[in-house]
Interface confidence: low
């Protein structure tokens, strides 16, 4: 996607977590929320659209409670002052999960997307364009927080003729680079620095009727399968990859494959067939020993919203899941530059892919 | 090589004010959580402060809460704590260290800096 | 804030001896619990991170389990290089805090 002006996603941030938005809510403008909910640590937690930091000024205010069976309440709070309350009696989330949580602000409401589907719709009670600031807390630990600014410009041709059976994400923009703002990412860590967040674009006709979003959309936004796309610059220390999606229910296994060449320099293979996250390189179409240890049980779940954040490192590559260090896998092939296509297939929908 | 490297710290009196650097090197300084932590003469470790200099997010414990500030260069990958209106309490061994992600505790430690506050 | 309560605050044991420390937290965790050694006059050093994950470099007499709240560090068979200061920290939610140390002393 081309992403001109929007800024860099929050990692890892703690919670309770204040942030800026920058340039401001805008129409079009996607919000992702990435995170797992907390087994027992209280009952609720929230995402705030707000004015500054006090908490005073909250345009809207979402947030899921684990109580009475479980519910959604949508608000909005001015000068101190919480207004009616409107609530959702089914609770998408579920405590101990990861989810997917999609924001898209339109020009009459927020749309909410839990795990690639739509949940509610929260109209606007306030002017939007005086939120600059996203909060989040509560029983939730965050993968991350990502942006995607609806300032796009088409790059290159949609796929087209891909089935697909449910909807993922927002419709999206188009592909293409994205300067990342002053000041956010660091000063010198390597050569090229640009971000490509990747969506699905093209095939008739949209769900959500939005002038700053191209014509030409999937129905049911999915991405292709498999999905390659380049890795712009390659691999190089301070490189983060982001990947989330949701495992298919009847899944056996899926890959996240970084490539160099036709090798793979780094293969991520869960298998659920034999409960185990499998990780090797093939150079030559051969294939080396297997990495298989894990300091806690299977984090992949059949049927379940998963998020994977691949950080490069000058010795390796260091993944997270769900929010949770995993492991580190030493490079095996070293001419980091080099790997620089990736490529994922296997029994999973993707919702959000940035490299 | 992985290096964190503290200084700053010296003998200050009550009210006044000192400023701690934590200079890393051998990592991609953005990409970790930068913690403070210090430890009183005979006594355990408390977390005082951190930051996530890629996004410059900052957190603080209450006890600091006011007085200090964490702050990072990424173009030097330094971290500093800026500590004003000390107070007798706030003497203790401060060093700095590293965390990966949101869940991985605390990898590397700098040797420390000992901060003493005292008319 | 989360407390996290260790015990004991000090044992005294002898080389080859098995040891085991616990913190137990006082609310929800997960597993985002380390495990640190701290020697007089030295920075800590990270054991085990996520409750139970060797932390590269670390001998594998140390290993840390998880039962719900309450975390636990073992020492297999204790080394004259084992004597320290041991802490527990969680990481979960702000702020991080740190177990009260146990102390581990030759009999």
């Known amino acids: 996607m081309a992403f001109s002006g929007s800024q860099a996603p929050y990692l890892s941030p703690a919670v309770p977590f204040s942030g800026t938005i920058q340039g401001g809510l805008q129409d079009g403008l996607q919000i992702t929320v990435n995170g797992t909910v907390l087994s027992s640590s209280g009952t609720r937690f929230a995402v705030n659209f707000q004015t500054g930091f006090s908490g005073n000024d909250i345009a809207f205010h979402f947030n899921p409670r684990f109580e009475d069976g479980g519910y959604v309440v949508c608000n909005t709070r001015q000068n101190g002052s919480w207004g009616p309350e409107e609530r959702k009696t089914h609770m998408p989330f579920q405590k101990g999960m990861p989810f997917d949580l999609c924001f898209l602000v339109q020009s009459s409401d927020f749309k909410v997307m839990v795990n690639g589907i739509l949940f509610v719709q929260y109209f606007h009670r306030v002017p939007f364009h005086r939120v600059d600031t996203i909060s989040v807390n509560g029983s939730v630990q965050l993968s991350y927080i990502s942006f995607q600014n609806p300032r796009t410009v088409p790059v290159q041709p949609a796929f087209s003729t891909v089935p697909f059976s449910q909807p993922v994400c927002f419709p999206p923009r188009p592909r293409g680079r994205r300067q990342k703002p002053p000041g956010v990412w660091p000063a010198n860590p390597a050569p090229i620095t640009q971000t490509v967040i990747h969506t699905v674009q093209s095939a008739p006709g949209q769900m959500f009727s939005t002038p700053a979003i191209p014509p030409m959309m999937y129905p049911h936004p999915a991405y292709p399968m498999p999905f390659i796309t380049t890795i712009l610059g390659g691999l190089y220390p301070s490189k983060s990859i982001l990947l989330s999606g949701t495992v298919l229910p009847s899944a056996q296994r899926f890959h996240i494959n970084l490539c160099s060449g036709n090798h793979i320099a780094f293969h991520l293979n869960p298998r659920f067939d034999e409960n185990a996250v499998v990780r090797n390189t093939q150079i030559d179409n051969s294939w080396g020993s297997e990495e298989r240890s894990l300091p806690r049980k299977m984090p992949f779940v059949r049927g379940q919203s998963f998020s994977v954040w691949i950080l490069c490192e000058a010795h390796c590559l260091k993944v997270a899941v769900d929010g949770q260090h995993l492991f580190e896998y030493y490079h095996r092939l070293r001419n980091l530059p080099t790997i620089n296509r990736l490529e994922v297939g296997g029994d999973i929908q993707l919702t959000h892919v940035q490299t | 090589e992985v290096q964190l490297v503290e200084s700053g710290g010296g003998l200050v009196q009550p009210g006044g004010s000192l400023r701690l650097s934590c200079a890393a090197s051998?990592?991609?300084?953005?990409?970790?959580?930068i913690h403070w932590v210090r430890q009183a003469p005979g006594k355990g470790l408390e977390w005082v402060a951190d930051i996530y200099p890629s996004s410059g997010y900052t957190y603080y414990a209450d006890s600091v809460k006011g007085r200090f500030t964490i702050s990072a260069d990424t173009s030097k990958n330094t971290a500093y704590l800026q500590m004003n209106s000390l107070r007798a309490e706030d003497t203790a061994v401060y060093y700095c260290?590293?965390?990966?992600?949101?869940?991985?505790?605390?990898?590397?430690w700098g040797q420390g800096t000992l901060v003493t506050v005292s008319s | 804030d989360i407390q996290m309560t260790q015990s004991p605050s000090s044992l005294s044991a002898s080389v080859g001896d098995r040891v085991t420390i616990t913190c137990r937290a006082s609310q929800s965790v997960s597993s985002a619990v380390a495990w640190y050694q701290q020697k007089p006059g030295k920075a800590p050093k990270l054991l085990i991170y996520?409750?139970?994950s060797l932390y590269s470099g670390v001998p594998s007499r140390f290993s840390g389990s998880r039962s719900g709240t309450d975390f636990t560090l073992t020492i297999s068979s204790l080394q004259p290089e084992d004597f320290a200061t041991y802490y527990c920290?969680?990481?979960?939610?702000?702020?991080?805090?740190f177990g009260q140390g146990t102390k581990v002393e030759i009999k």
């Open positions: 260290a590293r965390g990966w992600y949101a869940a991985y505790g605390m990898d590397y």
């Open positions: 051998g990592f991609t300084f953005s990409y970790y959580w």
């Open positions: 920290q969680q990481y979960a939610l702000r702020p991080l805090t």
């Open positions: 996520s409750a139970s």
